[in-house]
């Protein structure tokens, strides 16, 4: 018995070969002897029933001259899994067709962190093994159900599942979209008074995007977090529902989600969490955003530089007179110089690889007042 593997919805070709390598009479039947189609000597394909009943069945007329009389079954269904009989030259050839189907759980659009379940449907009596490969090359294998927990952004794309049965294989391709922001976290460094831009680009594109979102903010100086803004998303159009009076955030009307804080102030420094709930999806997308604010001031004989917000304890805060060695450098959130000499002073926040934030303050001779450029 010859075995042919097929995929639901696609086509399968069941072979039937003549030893003569020339056109001959043949008939394809179901195992219950019902006739499907055949050729009775006139080179004409005769179907065994009404066109509507047998329109999925065909043969390759072009192959007949070479002694090949395949049965083509289009738009395969699971119930097509059975034995088919080819009668020619006083012999019967049995061909077993097994139709398989691989589906993803409920939806192919899944939120980051959710689980993906791939299910194999197979005909009774079959004992296939299945292995699926993610777009980033991760292999999972198992029985009829394969699960991947904690989906990552890199899992977006085409998953390839190979079903193996009796040394024959059939390959399924399933497109999975992981719904997530491009970055899980970001940090913005700003001088006091500067405008702050927060961007929340999505890592996927869909035709219609509808949902609602909110930005919760935990200021470093505040004891509890508060909602800064809530918004709706309708077909990729953004509309603000509610915004706090302080700070008065502005929001872009189009994707990517974009928020503007008119001024970076010490009281705003801290961490935010933007959540986005998408229509018909359980769970939410999250992106963390952090704001670090720097302030350089001169009060009487004291020049001070301070930073607020979630800084790494490795960051160095320095005060230096332009083109000179740092006067003071500390891994702290505030540094100062007493009786600073006149000139342009720089406050620098740096790490091992770069200056992250810089603020300049002009110190005038003692009889003048300071100027902040």
């Amino acid at each position: 018995k010859t075995l042919v593997l097929g995929k639901e919805g696609e086509s399968a070709e069941l072979p039937c070969e003549s030893s003569q390598k020339k056109i001959t009479v043949f008939t394809w039947k179901f195992s219950d002897q019902r006739k499907i189609l055949g050729q009775h000597g006139k080179g004409v394909l005769i179907r065994g029933g009404s066109p509507s009943q047998f329109d999925r069945f065909d043969s390759k007329k072009g192959a007949w001259e070479k002694g090949s009389f395949p049965l083509i079954i289009n738009k395969l269904k699971m119930e097509d899994s059975q034995t088919y009989i080819c009668e020619l030259e006083n012999r019967k050839e049995e061909v077993e067709l097994w139709v398989f189907k691989v589906t993803a759980n409920s939806d192919t659009h899944l939120l980051q962190g959710q689980s993906l379940t791939l299910t194999l449907e197979s005909p009774p009596g079959s004992s296939p093994s299945v292995q699926c490969r993610s777009p980033r090359g991760k292999n999972i294998q198992g029985g009829k159900t394969l699960s991947v927990s904690q989906l990552e952004l890199q899992d977006s794309g085409t998953w390839t599942c190979t079903v193996l049965q009796n040394q024959k294989k059939v390959e399924f391709k399933i497109d999975i979209v992981v719904l997530a922001f491009q970055k899980a976290s970001s940090i913005v460094y700003k001088k006091e008074g500067e405008q702050v831009e927060f961007s929340f680009p999505l890592a996927f594109t869909v035709e219609k995007l509808t949902g609602s979102g909110e930005l919760w903010w935990q200021a470093e100086r505040a004891s509890s977090s508060k909602s800064w803004i809530t918004f709706d998303l309708k077909n990729k159009e953004v509309s603000v529902k509610r915004v706090t009076q302080d700070p008065k955030l502005q929001m872009g009307k189009k994707l990517p989600l974009h928020l503007t804080l008119p001024q970076a102030l010490p009281q705003y420094a801290g961490s935010g969490n933007l959540t986005l709930a998408l229509e018909a999806k359980t769970g939410k997308l999250h992106q963390e955003v952090n704001l670090v604010v720097m302030r350089a001031t001169q009060l009487q004989k004291n020049l001070t530089c301070e930073v607020w917000g979630p800084t790494s304890p490795k960051l160095m805060l320095s005060l230096k007179l332009e083109n000179k060695e740092a006067k003071v450098s500390k891994r702290e959130k505030a540094v100062w110089v007493l009786n600073p000499e006149a000139g342009m002073w720089q406050c620098l926040l740096s790490d091992s690889g770069q200056v992250l934030l810089e603020s300049n303050i002009k110190v005038l001779p003692t009889w003048s007042t300071p100027v902040q450029p």
Epitope: S185, S186, I187, Y189, N290, V292, T311, S312, P313, K314, L315, M316, A326, S329, L349, S350, D351, S352, G353, Q354, L356
Partner: antibody, heavy 122, light 107 residues
Framework: QVQLVESGGGVVQPGRSLRLSCAAS????????MHWVRQAPGKGLEWVAI????????YYADSVKGRFTISRDNSKNTLYLQMNSLRAEDTAVYYC???????????????WGKGTTVTVSS | AIQMTQSPSSLSASVGDRVTITCRAS??????LGWYQLKPGKAPKLLIY???SLQSGVPSSFSGSGSGTDFTLTISSLQPEDFATYYC?????????FGQGTKLEIK
């Protein structure tokens, strides 16, 4: 391609000095913090020291503080480790490695040299 | 200095197995943790940074998780080339400190 090559290792008596070098190529050396990390025979990895991109800030493991000095010459794309008052427990393979700093938030050592061996023995 | 306690110190496993290595910090280090692989005679190799970010070019069978004080490195399906020694490193604050290492051997 991005490469780090250590040199200067050898056999030295306890109490003596040795200077290791690390030649960097294939990247902008002056934009990265640089580390020394060591592995003693049969032991685990031990962080030794870091020097910031501009050479202004240096930090050391307690076990080498006061004896070792990390330095760099950005014009020569070279990192150094001056090791004084060497002890038997300083015997190790010494690796230089570059640190990537992202947004002052994420840090990692992505490029490592193959190492140079220092043996302190009388 | 921040102490890093890594466990187990050694581990025997077979090709295809799923293995987990843990690292505990003596104080909170947010996500300031990396995982490195070391093979005899070779330079250390970065696998995971910032606790859970997979370094470019590293197989997706490696994953990291955790935040604060408790961290995990998971290898979902061991390959022959994965038998090596693994170290966690806290890069949250100076001085940096490595865990004691976990030697992964073939069963």
């Amino acid at each position: 391609q991005v490469q780090l090559v250590e040199s200067g290792g050898g056999v030295v008596q306890p109490g003596r000095s040795l200077r290791l070098s690390c030649a960097a190529s294939g990247f902008t050396f002056s934009s990265y913090g640089m580390h020394w990390v060591r592995q003693a025979p049969g032991k685990g990895l031990e962080w030794v020291a870091i020097i910031w991109y501009d050479g202004n800030n240096k930090y050391y493991a307690d076990s080498v503080k006061g004896r070792f000095t990390i330095s760099r010459d950005n014009s020569k794309n070279t990192l150094y480790l001056q090791m004084n008052s060497l002890r038997a427990e300083d015997t190790a393979v010494y690796y230089c490695t570059r640190e990537v700093a992202l947004e002052g938030y994420y840090y990692y050592m992505d490029v490592w040299g193959k190492g140079t061996t220092v043996t302190v023995s009388s | 200095a921040i102490q890093m306690t890594q466990s187990p110190s050694s581990l025997s496993a077979s090709v295809g197995d799923r293995v987990t290595i843990t690292c505990r910090a003596s104080q909170g280090i947010r996500n300031g943790l990396g995982w490195y692989q070391l093979k005899p005679g070779k330079a250390p190799k970065l696998l995971i940074y910032a606790a859970s970010s997979l370094q470019s070019g590293v197989p997706s069978s490696f994953s990291g998780s955790g935040s604060g004080t408790d961290f995990t490195l998971t290898i979902s399906s061991l390959q022959p080339e994965d038998f090596a020694t693994y170290y966690c490193l806290q890069d949250y604050n100076y001085p940096y400190t490595f865990g004691q290492g976990t030697k992964l051997e073939i069963k």
